[in-house]
Structure formats: structure tokens, C-alpha cells
């Protein structure tokens, strides 16, 4: 058992048909040393008397929040949820597991730029009685700071029958250099709690490694004389790092139809410029990518050729 | 310690397609590890990041862009002096700053080639004979130096007397192929920032 | 299966006109780019032009800009290549080459060897 | 035009050994180079697009990198099937252009 915040704590539960639980002693936080009793939730059953309490914790119905009383006056409260550990591994049912870039991927992160802020995200179908608390450092012996905001609900959607919810949240890293090499990753902690159910999840990365810029902007399209042939010229996203020369962007500028089986022009180019074919009904798309560590591309920005 | 905007004229600058090169070639190389070394601890989440130049250069910080010059967590305090004449300084406005940051990129590419060479040489003795170094990185990585042209002491191949631990050397292998990729990456980096000032 | 189908090999007087045929099957004519590259005997590859047998639109290498017509027929999913002004310097094997992407070329026809010679 | 020049024009190897090609372009073209694979009577074959894109169906011992103006096409380890002609073709701009291509020959 361990603390996970004041009056909150965690029992670490192996979790097969029978097992014996792990037993807990509770201590009422009060200088009262007589007359004390012991409830569960919001129950009355009085479960025992005394300072300390011991109870087995075997499942669901072991856990909740425990209170001491004398004489009707609330003493104190201890909160006991489980973490369940099946075949040595710990349960992941809070969260869904996104699957990319793999398996068992349940946090995703992306950087803007190198700025050292990025954004994390996590997915469920869970939609009531769920916390979650979200810490970070770089390096894990000898951590440096990152901080962290509150985790909010950005996104609903509906998949099939179900409903996905999406969380995320913002990091900083507090004193980070754009230009420095990195050799410790960042590591995300996120705590979920659903109901009295709680799990960890954890990623590590570099900051290189999950820049995805944001689309170039102020697309603008020139017709060339006597030509099918159309100039488009892009700006780098004001959200990218500067100066542009040493944080350099390489683009993809795309013609195509409203479907991907259709035929398209596609030219790659470290320009903020190109020359393509454009077509009636087709739209010019760029994106951008960092010119010398291939990390994610860019979303699209697109205009319509006509 | 940063450069300055005052740098050669633009195309007057041999290094920039050299670092391009380099960057290709030791992404490349770092590619064909991964692939050929499968088996072994060879991807960026399994191997220890190590950079063999700490404490010895300090490219980074010498070769900040000015606009940088303003964050103070890019402002280490590391001091290194180094040798400051080069070709890749194709202008006589050339600062000293400019001088000090790519000597230190040439320092940082000479460490890298004893140990690349270090390496081969024990990875040639492998009777598996699994995975050698690209000789077009190394060429490469001669061609960056001659481009930046300075001149410095000699270090000595390392030798070792002991038979090699080839699994070690491979996975020793990984772990430069990685720092020497970031380290790639910034002198692309600073070779582009240097072009376009 | 795509397939592209070249016309048979021809014999021109210089100065004559060579009109060369490639019958697309397999995939729908209209999806992609249509393109004519040449190679004369023991050299390399030249790039001629291309069409897109949607609306027609086409692009010329400037070397055979005014000499060089390609069209498109949808309905027989053929596309044409004339070349006018013919010198003995056109000897060549013709082949059309189409793909979904403008720029290069994923599937060739077998060729069509246009000789001139007086 | 962007002229395309390809190194050696005549290249012998040993079947089972590797051989790489290069390609250089007159100017800067990204990755918008494109590898063709002829053999004596037949049309040419795309082997990689965008210097270094893998096309469905050709064998993974071909492979391809550069950006800017070097390229290079390596044979990792060369079969009987791959004596041929190689050719490079830039897509950077309108006239498209080929190299003057690289025989691979049996040593």
C-alpha cells in the first residue's frame, strides 16, 4: 500500500480467482485514543473500534472510503483504491489502447516545435467518475522539471455504438534550450482513477521524435502565363521554432481530386515555392516536415485550384 | 558564445553540401545497423544515449544562433578553445566565434572517425562478419573535414590487445550511430543557419 | 492487369509525319497521366510529353514543342502521339507510360520502333 | 533543363556482391528523383520513387537514398536477373529528365 495524496491510498492487488488480498491497518489521524469506530462509505455498519483498523482487501467491495468517528464527529477519512496486477502484468482498462505508432500504446504526445511544450493525449469510453492527475520530468535518476496543467476533456466522439472521450494535457519543460541535443527522454506519468479503480500510465520520448509541425499557412496561388502550370507559394507556421535557417522545414505540395484513388501532381521541395499542375475540381495541399530529423508531417493546408 | 549574423556570402559556402551528406550517410548507416542488428538493442528507446564529445567540444553552444543567444537555457557556461582557421570561412569578415564553432564541429568529427575506425577494425575481425561500416560515411566524414580544413593534433588510433566482445562492439555501434546522428543533425543545422545568414 | 499496347514498328521519309497509338487496359483511361518517352538506339531515355485524358490538358517538352501532339480518345481508351517534321535523328523506339501520379511512370508499353530513313 | 549525369556509365560487379549507382542533378531537386530498371527488348521498370520509396514488388535488396543533388541506388547484393541498365529521372521540374544510365554488367 501506498500514499497517492493526502488521505489517498493505493493497494496493490495481485488479481486471480482466490487470492488472499493484502491486508491493510488503518490509523484514525487523531490524538482520541478511545471510543473510536469505523465505517465504509455510507454505510453505517460500524466494521470494527479502536485507533487502527485491519481489514483484508481481496476486490472492488474491500475498497472505498473509510472513516472514523466518536460520538457521531467525523475524525478522519482514508481513502483506499486497488491497482490490479493480472499475470504480473497491471490492468489498463481505464484507457484505450490507441495502437499507433503500436501496440499498447495508451499516450500520445506532440510537439509544435522545440520549444520543449507539447501536448498529450489519452482516449476512453468512460464518462463519469474518472480523475486523472498528470506528472513529468526529464530523465528519471536525476529528474529536471517539467510542469504540467490539469487534464481536460478536449474531444467527444462517437465510435459505433460507444461514445470516446479525449484528454489531454499541456507540458513545459521549464528550462529548455531549442537548439540542445537531447540525451534524456521526457517521461509522462499519468494517474487514472475511475471510480475506486486505479491504473498508471507512463511514456518516454524525445522532443525531437514527437515534433510534428503545424501546417504551413498563407497558401497563395499564380496562375504562369501560357501554362497549366500554377506557382504556390507557403509560409513556415508561426508556431515553428526560429530562426527558420537553422530550424529548417521541407515541404510536400500535392494536387489531387476530393479522392485519394484519384491521380495527382506531387513535388517535394525545401522552397517556399512550387510549380504544379493544377486541375479543375482539385485542391493544392502542403505540408511540412523538419528537414533534417524526419519526425511526423504537418496536417494539410490546402486551397482549391480553380 | 553564438555566431554572428555577419557570415560568408550566400553560395560562397563549401560545407553546407558536405553536411548534407553526412546527415544522409550516417542516417543511412544508422538504418542498415537497425535493420542488420535486429536481435540486438539498437533502437532509439533501447539503447543508453551517450555523447562521446561531452566535455571535450562544446558544438552546441558555439555554434548558437544569435536569436538563441536571448533563452538562458541555451547559455551553458562550458569554455573550450580551439584552433581558428578554416577553409568553410570563405569571407574575410569571418568572426571568431564563427571560427570557434566550426573547429569544434571538426573536433567533434575527428573524435567520431578514431572511433568509427576503432570500431571497423574489430567488427572486421568478427567471423560472422554481420555488419562493417559504410566506407561512403567515413569518406564523408573525411570530406566534411577537409572542407572546414583546420589543423590539429593527430589522435591515435586506439588498439586493443584484447579479443574484442564483437556483441559489445555492435551494440557500441548502435549507441554512436545514434549520438553521431543527433550531432548530425545539429552541423546540418548550423551549416543552413551560417548559408542563409 | 494494366496493360498498354503500343501500335506496330513504322517506316517514315524525313519531313513525313509519324502518328503512334497505346490502347490502355485494365484500370479506368481517364485515372491517369499518359505520358510519351523516346529512346533512340543505344542511348538513354528522353521525356516527349503528357496528357490527361480527362479534359485533355497536355505539357510539351520544350525540344519538341510544334512538332510533338499528343491526344486522348476515352471512348477506345487509346491515347495518340504524332510526330511532325520527322529527321533521320527521330529514329527511335516510342513508348507510352502512364501512372496515377504525374511525375514518373509505373507501368510502360512495349515500345514502337518509328525508323526514318530516306 | 535539369541535366541528370549518373556515375559510373559502366559498371561490372560479381553476382552475390553489392553495387551502387550514383545520380547527381545540375541542381537542388529534394527527393524528387525516381529509379528505372531496363533490360535488353524491354520497357524500363520503376524501382524506387522519390529517392528512396520502396514499390510493391521489387525486391527488397534494392534500395535508394539522396536529397538535394547526390543520389545513390545500391544493389545490396546483386542476382543474375539484375544485370541491367539503371536509369535516374528527375521530377522536380517540367522537362522531366533522365540519366544517361548506368549498365551493370557481369564481371
Known amino acids: 500500500i501506498w500514499e497517492l495524496k493526502k488521505d489517498v491510498y493505493v493497494v496493490e492487488l495481485d488479481w486471480y480467482p482466490d487470492a488472499p488480498g493484502e491486508m491493510v491497518v488503518l490509523t484514525c489521524d487523531t490524538p482520541e485514543e478511545d471510543g473510536i469506530t469505523w465505517t465504509l462509505d455510507q454505510s453505517s455498519e460500524v466494521l470494527g473500534s479502536g485507533k487502527t483498523l485491519t481489514i483484508q482487501v481481496k476486490e472492488f467491495g474491500d475498497a472505498g472510503q473509510y472513516t472514523c468517528h466518536k460520538g457521531g464527529e467525523v475524525l478522519s477519512h482514508s481513502l483506499l483504491l486497488l491497482h490490479k496486477k493480472e499475470d504480473g502484468i497491471w490492468s489498463t482498462d481505464i484507457l484505450k489502447d490507441q495502437k499507433e505508432p503500436k501496440n499498447k500504446t495508451f499516450l500520445r504526445c506532440e510537439a509544435k516545435n522545440y520549444s520543449g511544450r507539447f501536448t498529450c493525449w489519452w482516449l476512453t469510453t468512460i464518462s463519469t467518475d474518472l480523475t486523472f492527475s498528470v506528472k513529468s520530468s526529464r530523465g528519471s535518476s536525476d529528474p529536471q522539471g517539467v510542469t504540467c496543467g490539469a487534464a481536460t476533456l478536449s474531444a467527444e466522439r462517437v465510435r459505433g455504438d460507444n461514445k470516446e472521450y479525449e484528454y489531454s494535457v499541456e507540458c513545459q519543460e521549464d528550462s529548455a534550450c531549442p537548439a540542445a541535443e537531447e540525451s534524456l527522454p521526457i517521461e509522462v506519468m499519468v494517474d487514472a482513477v475511475h471510480k475506486l479503480k486505479y491504473e498508471n500510465y507512463t511514456s518516454s520520448f524525445f522532443i525531437r521524435d514527437i515534433i510534428k509541425p503545424d501546417p504551413p499557412k498563407n497558401l497563395q496561388l499564380k496562375p504562369l502565363k501560357n501554362s497549366r502550370q500554377v506557382e504556390v507559394s507557403w509560409e513556415y507556421p508561426d508556431t515553428w521554432s526560429t530562426p527558420h535557417s537553422y530550424f529548417s522545414l521541407t515541404f510536400c505540395v500535392q494536387v489531387q481530386g476530393k479522392s485519394k484513388r484519384e491521380k495527382k501532381d506531387r513535388v517535394f521541395t525545401d522552397k517556399t515555392s512550387a510549380t504544379v499542375i493544377c486541375r479543375k475540381n482539385a485542391s493544392i495541399s502542403v505540408r511540412a516536415q523538419d528537414r533534417y530529423y524526419s519526425s511526423s508531417w504537418s496536417e494539410w493546408a490546402s486551397v482549391p485550384c480553380s | 558564445r553564438n555566431l554572428p549574423v555577419a557570415t560568408p556570402d550566400p553560395g560562397m559556402f563549401p560545407c553546407l553540401h558536405h553536411s548534407q551528406n553526412l546527415l544522409r550517410a550516417v542516417s543511412n548507416m544508422l538504418q542498415k545497423a537497425r535493420q542488420t542488428l535486429e536481435f540486438y538493442p539498437c533502437t532509439s528507446e533501447e539503447i543508453d544515449h551517450e555523447d562521446i564529445t561531452k566535455d571535450k567540444t562544446s558544438t552546441v553552444e558555439a555554434c548558437l544562433p544569435l536569436e538563441l543567444t536571448k533563452n538562458e537555457s541555451c547559455l551553458n557556461s562550458r569554455e573550450t578553445s580551439f584552433i581558428t582557421n578554416g577553409s568553410c570561412l570563405a569571407s574575410r569578415k569571418t568572426s571568431f566565434m564563427m571560427a570557434l564553432c566550426l573547429s569544434s564541429i571538426y573536433e567533434d568529427l575527428k573524435m567520431y572517425q578514431v572511433e568509427f575506425k576503432t570500431m571497423n577494425a574489430k567488427l572486421l575481425m568478427d567471423p560472422k562478419r554481420q555488419i562493417f561500416l559504410d566506407q561512403n560515411m567515413l569518406a564523408v566524414i573525411d570530406e566534411l573535414m577537409q572542407a572546414l580544413n583546420f589543423n590539429s593534433e593527430t589522435v591515435p588510433q586506439k588498439s586493443s590487445l584484447e579479443e574484442p566482445d564483437f556483441y559489445k562492439t555492435k551494440i557500441k555501434l548502435c549507441i554512436l550511430l545514434h549520438a553521431f546522428r543527433i550531432r548530425a543533425v545539429t552541423i546540418d543545422r548550423v551549416m543552413s543557419y551560417l548559408n542563409a545568414s | 492487369q494494366v496493360q498498354l499496347v503500343q501500335s506496330g514498328a513504322e517506316v517514315k521519309k524525313p519531313g513525313s509525319s509519324v502518328k503512334v497509338s497505346c490502347k490502355a487496359s485494365?484500370?479506368?483511361?481517364?485515372?491517369?497521366?499518359l505520358h510519351w518517352v523516346r529512346q533512340a538506339p543505344g542511348q538513354g531515355l528522353e521525356w516527349m510529353g503528357w496528357?490527361?485524358?480527362?479534359?485533355?490538358?497536355?505539357e510539351y517538352a520544350p525540344k519538341f514543342q510544334g512538332r510533338v501532339t499528343i491526344t486522348a480518345d476515352e471512348s477506345t481508351s487509346t491515347a495518340y502521339m504524332e510526330l511532325s517534321s520527322l529527321r533521320s535523328e527521330d529514329t527511335a523506339v516510342y513508348a507510352c507510360?502512364?501512372?496515377?501520379?504525374?511525375?514518373?511512370?509505373?507501368?510502360w508499353g512495349q515500345g514502337t520502333l518509328v525508323t526514318v530513313s530516306s | 533543363d535539369i541535366v541528370m549525369t549518373q556515375s559510373p556509365l559502366s559498371l561490372p560487379v560479381t553476382p552475390g556482391e553489392p553495387a551502387s549507382i550514383s545520380c547527381r542533378a545540375s541542381?537542388?531537386?529534394?527527393?524528387?528523383l525516381h529509379w528505372y530498371q531496363q533490360k535488353p527488348g524491354q520497357q524500363p521498370r520503376l524501382l524506387i520513387a522519390?529517392?528512396?520509396q520502396s514499390i510493391s514488388g521489387v525486391p527488397s535488396r534494392f534500395s535508394g537514398s539522396g536529397s538535394g543533388t547526390d543520389f545513390t541506388l545500391t544493389i545490396s547484393s546483386l542476382q543474375p536477373e539484375d544485370f541491367a541498365t539503371y536509369y535516374c529521372?528527375?521530377?522536380?521540374?517540367?522537362?522531366?529528365?533522365f540519366g544517361q544510365g548506368t549498365k551493370v554488367e557481369i564481371k
Open positions: 507510360a502512364r501512372n496515377k501520379e504525374l511525375r514518373y511512370f509505373d507501368v
Open positions: 485494365g484500370g479506368t483511361f481517364s485515372d491517369y497521366y
Open positions: 496528357i490527361d485524358p480527362e479534359n485533355g490538358d497536355t
Open positions: 541542381q537542388s531537386i529534394s527527393i524528387n
Open positions: 522519390f529517392a528512396s
Open positions: 529521372q528527375q521530377s522536380n521540374s517540367f522537362p522531366l529528365t
